[in-house]
């Protein structure tokens, strides 16, 4: 079952061959059962095969590993640890594999791992040390550059009594291992808030995707340290207004592009600063598409077309004049 020389073609191993495999390190041209391998492309694909664990006999040449659409359930410590190690593995895609638990040290002994995709797995239990590998206050730096965690929120009945946001952030910050992370995608996770310390500790971020969450406010979030940030996706959240502090921080980032579409902007007196900023800034992509959702009289008005006279707040009545 040797891979062909063409980078675009894959060899797949026959079960009767694989059943003869011993527990010795894999042969250079060996391909695990239920997988397709291309040594030329340094790629192994074990896709939609209902695997319940990571194959032990992955070829040492693998650089790109696709384990999508399986039923892995659990990634234990050292799930990819091999002798000799998978020293070239750079891109690992585990999306849609029914993972609900990722244990401490799951990605240890992968010295070249730069891209990791855990999207579309209901991660009820993401260890704080899943990415750092140890509970030391400062861990060895992770080689990860891209971490894709879109739609990893479990169903409500499977969530613990703790904050899901807190669980994810603990894993991102543990041991300061992800200081080199450049791309972080956290879309579609029902996040209600962004813990204030998370961005400050990921100083290398270039791309941050928080789209399709339930973020109501960025008041306590600081973007000041993210001097390399190039794109910030905040589409499809529950943002009502961006306040002065946030506007100033975003404006101060030299390379930033911000995406704000499909948020329920509240066009009252608190929106005045944001409207003024929108008219002047170049950082917001598609700013002409931003429209008011509230109050009712302002619905669908384009933010860029508003002036200060449009942005009023109903006076707060003293208690004696309020009706029930």
């Amino acid at each position: 079952s040797s891979p062909t020389s063409s980078a675009s073609s894959f060899s797949s191993s026959a079960p009767f061959l694989a059943s003869a495999v011993s527990a010795q390190p894999p042969l250079p041209d060996q391909c695990p059962a239920l997988c397709e391998c291309s040594e030329a492309a340094r790629t192994v694909k074990c896709v939609n095969r209902n695997l319940t664990e990571v194959p032990t006999d992955l070829p040492a040449y693998v650089r790109n590993l696709f384990l999508t659409g399986n039923q892995l359930a659990v990634l234990p410590a050292g799930a990819f640890a091999r002798r000799p190690p998978l020293a070239e593995l750079a891109a690992l895609n585990l999306s849609g594999s029914r993972l609900d638990e990722v244990r401490a040290g799951a990605f240890e002994h992968l010295p070249s791992l730069r891209q990791l995709d855990l999207s579309h797995n209901p991660l009820a239990d993401l260890s704080p040390f899943a990415f750092s590998g140890s509970n030391a206050s400062v861990s060895a730096p992770s080689p990860l550059v891209e971490l894709i965690l879109n739609h990893i929120v479990p169903p409500e009945d499977e969530r613990q009594n703790r904050s899901f946001e807190g669980m994810v952030v603990a894993a991102l910050l543990a041991g300061r291992a992800l200081q080199g992370l450049r791309r972080l995608e956290l879309a579609s996770n029902h996040f209600l808030y962004l813990p204030r310390d998370v961005l400050a500790q990921l100083p290398s971020l270039r791309h941050l995707d928080l789209s399709n969450n339930s973020l109501v406010s960025l008041t306590y979030v600081s973007f000041r340290n993210l001097t390399h940030l190039e794109s910030l996706h905040l589409e499809d959240n529950a943002l009502k207004v961006l306040h002065n502090g946030t506007l100033a921080e975003l404006q101060g980032l030299p390379h930033i592009r911000v995406f704000l579409d499909n948020n329920p902007w509240v066009c009252d007196c608190h929106m005045a600063d944001m409207v003024t900023w929108l008219k002047e800034t170049e950082v917001v992509q598609g700013k002409d598409r931003l429209t008011c959702a509230y109050p009712e009289k302002m619905r669908n008005r384009v933010l860029l077309e508003l002036n200060s006279a449009d942005l009023d707040c109903d006076p707060i009545l003293p208690p004696s004049l309020q009706t029930s």
Partner: antibody, heavy 120, light 111 residues
Framework: EVQLVESGGGVVQPGRSLRLSCAAS????????MHWVRQAPGKGLEWVAY????????YYADSVKGRFTISRDNSKNTLYLQMNSLRAEDTAVYYC?????????????WGQGTTVTVSS | DIVLTQSPDSLAVSLGERATINCRAS??????????MHWYQQKPGQPPKLLIK???NLESGVPDRFSGSGSGTDFTLTISSLQAEDVAVYYC?????????FGGGTKVEIK
């Protein structure tokens, strides 16, 4: 009805080899990981080896590593245990057992067992 | 390796009375969400039979007088009202990591 039937046991001298088989029926064999577990006379249970549904993953107890090899033939619905360099302490009833998923659940079906006696 | 210690080694209980068996692991076999401890019943001359999976989930077809509880390192199998057919040896087993290990067994008899 799920059935697992072991065979291949017997009396063998130390240092010799034996191959056990486990014939599976009543379920889609290729969807399940399989284990061998043994029980020495009058003793408790000892896990021996595991093989994943597609034979891409296998694990062994330290006590048998390098001597025993687990394999399967999904086209024949059969699990095997090749036992080499047998020792007196390998004397036991050997059971094959099925697991729905590697970590999460227990061994939900077991065969009746086959007896291996290593004696000079 | 994770060592599972069962207690007591044997247990004599009157018919209709409660029987409780404990299993302690040398390290945690639970994550914050799941437990990887299972219980088996073995009658003389028969293979083991799965009773409880993942600490507390009753296997299909097992009478509801059997129940399991616990997490971390301490687990319990309870037979709420012992019947004559429950005379057997009971084993705990973890699947947290390789190697899987079994407890030493608890023999349940009728007093």
């Amino acid at each position: 009805e799920v059935q697992l039937v072991e065979s291949g046991g017997g009396v063998v001298q130390p240092g010799r080899s034996l191959r056990l088989s486990c014939a599976a029926s009543g379920f889609t064999f290729s969807n399940f990981g399989m284990h061998w577990v043994r029980q020495a006379p009058g003793k408790g249970l000892e896990w021996v080896a595991y093989i994943s549904s597609g034979s891409s993953t296998f694990y062994y107890a330290d006590s048998v590593k390098g001597r025993f090899t687990i394999s399967r033939d999904n086209s024949k619905n059969t699990l095997y245990l090749q036992m080499n360099s047998l020792r007196a302490e390998d004397t036991a009833v050997y059971y094959c057992a099925r697991s729905p998923a590697y970590y999460r659940y227990g061994l939900d079906y077991w065969g009746q067992g086959t007896t291996v006696t290593v004696s000079s | 390796d994770i060592v599972l210690t069962q207690s007591p080694d044997s247990l004599a209980v009157s018919l209709g009375e409660r029987a409780t068996i404990n299993c302690r692991a040398s390290q945690s076999v639970s994550s914050s969400t799941f437990s990887y401890m299972h219980w088996y019943q073995q009658k003389p001359g028969q293979p083991p039979k799965l009773l409880i999976k993942s600490s507390s989930n009753l296997e299909s077809g097992v009478p509801d007088r059997f129940s399991g509880s616990g997490s971390g390192t301490d687990f319990t199998l309870t037979i709420s009202s012992l019947q004559a057919e429950d005379v057997a040896v009971y084993y705990c087993q973890h699947s947290w990591e390789i190697p899987y290990t079994f407890g030493g067994g608890t023999k349940v008899e009728i007093k």
